[in-house]
């Protein structure tokens, strides 16, 4: 379920835009990144074609938002919320958040100022 967002500006417009784009490639790209850094999953090559393809698809999807720059934080928050219950280790959650905050830069967007990724009522 989508949570209430408490940010400045027209967040309802951003919510609609975030709803319209497919965030799955972004979620898959970041999961592949953090899986590649897990010792127990050393068979994952984070530089694989699969990962770079997902990154490109992710950037394309984020670009589909009319106000990509203004709505970037909402998009990142939604990705975090969608994957929160997949991450059962505090270090992994921190890793996921770090990768998430790097995402705008990877897609050649400006990083959003003050974006709170603690979106799951203390769960993540």
């Amino acid at each position: 379920m989508r949570r209430e967002r408490g940010r400045q500006g027209d967040s309802s417009s951003c919510e609609r835009q975030v709803d319209r784009v497919n965030l799955k490639p972004c979620e898959q790209h970041i999961m592949q990144r953090i899986m590649g850094e897990q010792e127990q999953y050393d068979s994952y090559d984070i530089r694989s074609t699969r990962s770079s393809d997902q990154q490109q698809r992710c950037c394309d999807e984020l670009n589909e938002m009319e106000n990509t720059q203004r709505c970037m934080c909402e998009a990142l928050q939604q990705i975090m919320e969608n994957q929160c219950d997949r991450l059962q280790d505090r270090q992994m959650v921190q890793q996921f958040k770090r990768e998430l905050m790097n995402l705008p830069q990877q897609c050649n967007f400006r990083a959003p100022q003050r974006c709170d990724l603690d979106v799951s009522g203390g769960r993540c």
Epitope: E27, Q28, M31, Q38, Q40, N82, D85, R86, D89
Partner: antibody, heavy 118, light 111 residues
Framework: EVQLVESGGGLVQPGRSLRLSCAAS????????MHWVRQAPGKGLEWVSS????????DYADSVKGRFTISRDNARHSLYLQMNSLRAEDTALYYC???????????WGQGTLVTVSS | DIVMTQSPLSLPVTPGEPASISCRSS???????????LDWYLQKPGQSPQLLIS???NRASGVPDRFSGSGSGTDFTLKISRVEAEDVGVYYC????????FGQGTKVELK
Amino acid sequence: EVQLVESGGGLVQPGRSLRLSCAASGFTFDDYTMHWVRQAPGKGLEWVSSIRWNSGNLDYADSVKGRFTISRDNARHSLYLQMNSLRAEDTALYYCVKDNGLRTLDFWGQGTLVTVSS
Amino acid sequence: DIVMTQSPLSLPVTPGEPASISCRSSQSLLHRNGYNYLDWYLQKPGQSPQLLISLASNRASGVPDRFSGSGSGTDFTLKISRVEAEDVGVYYCMQALQTWTFGQGTKVELK
């Protein structure tokens, strides 16, 4: 080396309570989700409950919901299972299990036996 | 709730021969992040269960490479390329997409 040592099992009458404990060592206990899984004599495995590292999320199997309570003390590296209103069908070997961070159960204790009988 | 169904429930094996266990889930275990939340465990006689395969196809640390996992969605398979005497025990599949549920188990014993 990861070690999980369960205790607190024993013979108890139906309707009574019991509290299981699990002492963890060999890993950063307060970073990981922990689980209880049980196995009735001669039967298969049944997941019972889980607790996130920060106790921010507790999950229970339908069969124990409202009767069992999972908790943890990160300072003591300990996991607990408070079992109330015990039934004969709760008779099982109870395992303390560590999550690897990706919802996989990667280390298991030796188990503690709970027998509910009058 | 997701129901896990294993087959066969009993599997007599000959050392050196291959063996295969099937696991089917009542709904897809493929998450939107691209991973299948399906693990395999082995419980040897008198021991606690041990992790063999996670996320459908990833061998756990220390697990011999004769064990392999495959499948996606609702159909999964555990294969042992050449069974050894130490492989006897009960094999369980487990879904971790929604809480956690185990299959009934497959008892592997020597012929």
